[in-house]
Interface confidence: medium
């Protein structure tokens, strides 16, 4: 299953990055799971994961660093709390969980660049 | 003449970006000219230019936004005062001016990403 996501995104100076993950659904899925993975130096880490029923809101874990909304086959993902050391390739993985058959799609990744802000001068 | 430069550089939160421009000199040039060009939306603009004698410092114009140092066939370039809207492809152009023959090399460009910092809160 094909998954599309932008090649490059810049995090804001507040450490927030948003991108769209779009999948070409071969069937009429009602339950979809979206996972964001970070790949850097050949190491892959899960950033966050959410399950949603088509037409409903994404449900992330209770203290996820991601938020998101869904619209049809598009998922708008926002990652918060990013630091310069988090610069890397963020891969969108989409699973069509229900009804069968199960489908899996993995995007090529979005390179997210993060720059730490300069500290503000002390106010004396 | 081959010119190498990094594919991507992030400007610091102070709007400063540095990268190395390296050229494969076919001869023993004594006078070299380095020009930085910015390409965005198919429009090319000169950012700065410097001429230097091998073994000496680069001489930019006195109000140039660039500074740099040279070491052999490598030029270390720094561009200052960058804003988010300056994000673009920065191309290094190297000309071997003297002695003849004249050689020209153009790099593939360095994509410089710039994020404007958040304003600091007012100190009351």
């Amino acid at each position: 299953m094909h998954v599309a996501q932008p090649a490059v995104v810049l995090a804001s100076s507040r450490g927030i990055a948003s991108f769209v993950c779009e999948y070409a659904s071969p069937g009429k899925a009602t339950e979809v799971r979206v996972t964001v993975l970070r790949q850097a130096d050949s190491q892959v880490t899960e950033v966050c994961a959410a399950t949603y029923m088509m037409g409903n809101e994404l449900t992330f874990l209770d203290d996820s660093i991601c938020t998101g909304t869904s619209s049809g086959n598009q998922v708008n993902l926002t990652i918060q709390g990013l630091r310069a050391m988090d610069t890397g390739l963020y891969i969108c993985k989409v699973e069509l969980m229900y009804p069968p058959p199960y489908y899996l799609g993995i995007g090529n990744g979005t390179q997210i660049y993060v720059i730490d802000p300069e500290p503000c001068p002390d106010s004396d | 003449m081959h010119v190498a430069q990094p594919a991507v550089v992030l400007a610091s939160s102070r709007g400063i970006a540095s990268f190395v421009c390296e050229y494969a000199s076919p001869g023993k040039a004594t006078e070299v000219r380095v020009t930085v060009l910015r390409q965005a939306d198919s429009q090319v603009t000169e950012v700065c230019a410097a001429t230097y004698m091998m073994g000496n410092e680069l001489t930019f114009l006195d109000d140039s936004i660039c500074t740099g140092t040279s070491s052999g066939n490598q030029v270390n370039l720094t561009i200052q005062g960058l804003r988010a809207m300056d994000t673009g492809l920065y191309i290094c152009k190297v000309e071997l001016m003297y002695p003849p023959p004249y050689y020209l090399g153009i790099g593939n460009g360095t994509q410089i990403y710039v994020i404007d910092p958040e304003p600091c809160p007012d100190s009351d």
């Epitope: 950033v47 966050c48 874990l61 996820s64 660093i65 991601c66 050391m85 988090d86 | -």
Partner: nanobody, 126 residues
Framework: QVQLQESGGGSVQAGGSLKLSCAAS???????????MGWFRQTPGKERERVAT???????IYADSVKGRFTISKDNVKNTLYLQMNSLKPEDTAMYYC?????????????????WGQGTQVTVSS
Amino acid sequence: QVQLQESGGGSVQAGGSLKLSCAASGYTDYTYNTSCMGWFRQTPGKERERVATVNKVGSTIYADSVKGRFTISKDNVKNTLYLQMNSLKPEDTAMYYCAARGSWSCSQFWGDFGYWGQGTQVTVSS
């Protein structure tokens, strides 16, 4: 391989305090700094329950029963997770486990955590 080792458990009177520590090894600095970590507890015959978790950005979540009494903290230099337990009650008696996820985000479900310590016993008497 990631390994977690708890310490600091013991017996204490109700109203007393204990500080649990969990030393992590097998991590790169970056992976430790960004991994969700937490404390769970279990009493015989009951399911493991979340006590407190801390995610990559330092956001913490506590079980309702420990809010205001327990504090979770993470030392990214020493690669150590702590749980400061104050105003202990007899119902806090349990085996306390340190846990980690291969994720920046946490979960209340113990099954989502892939790495576990051996546990340290906390006993609170009235």
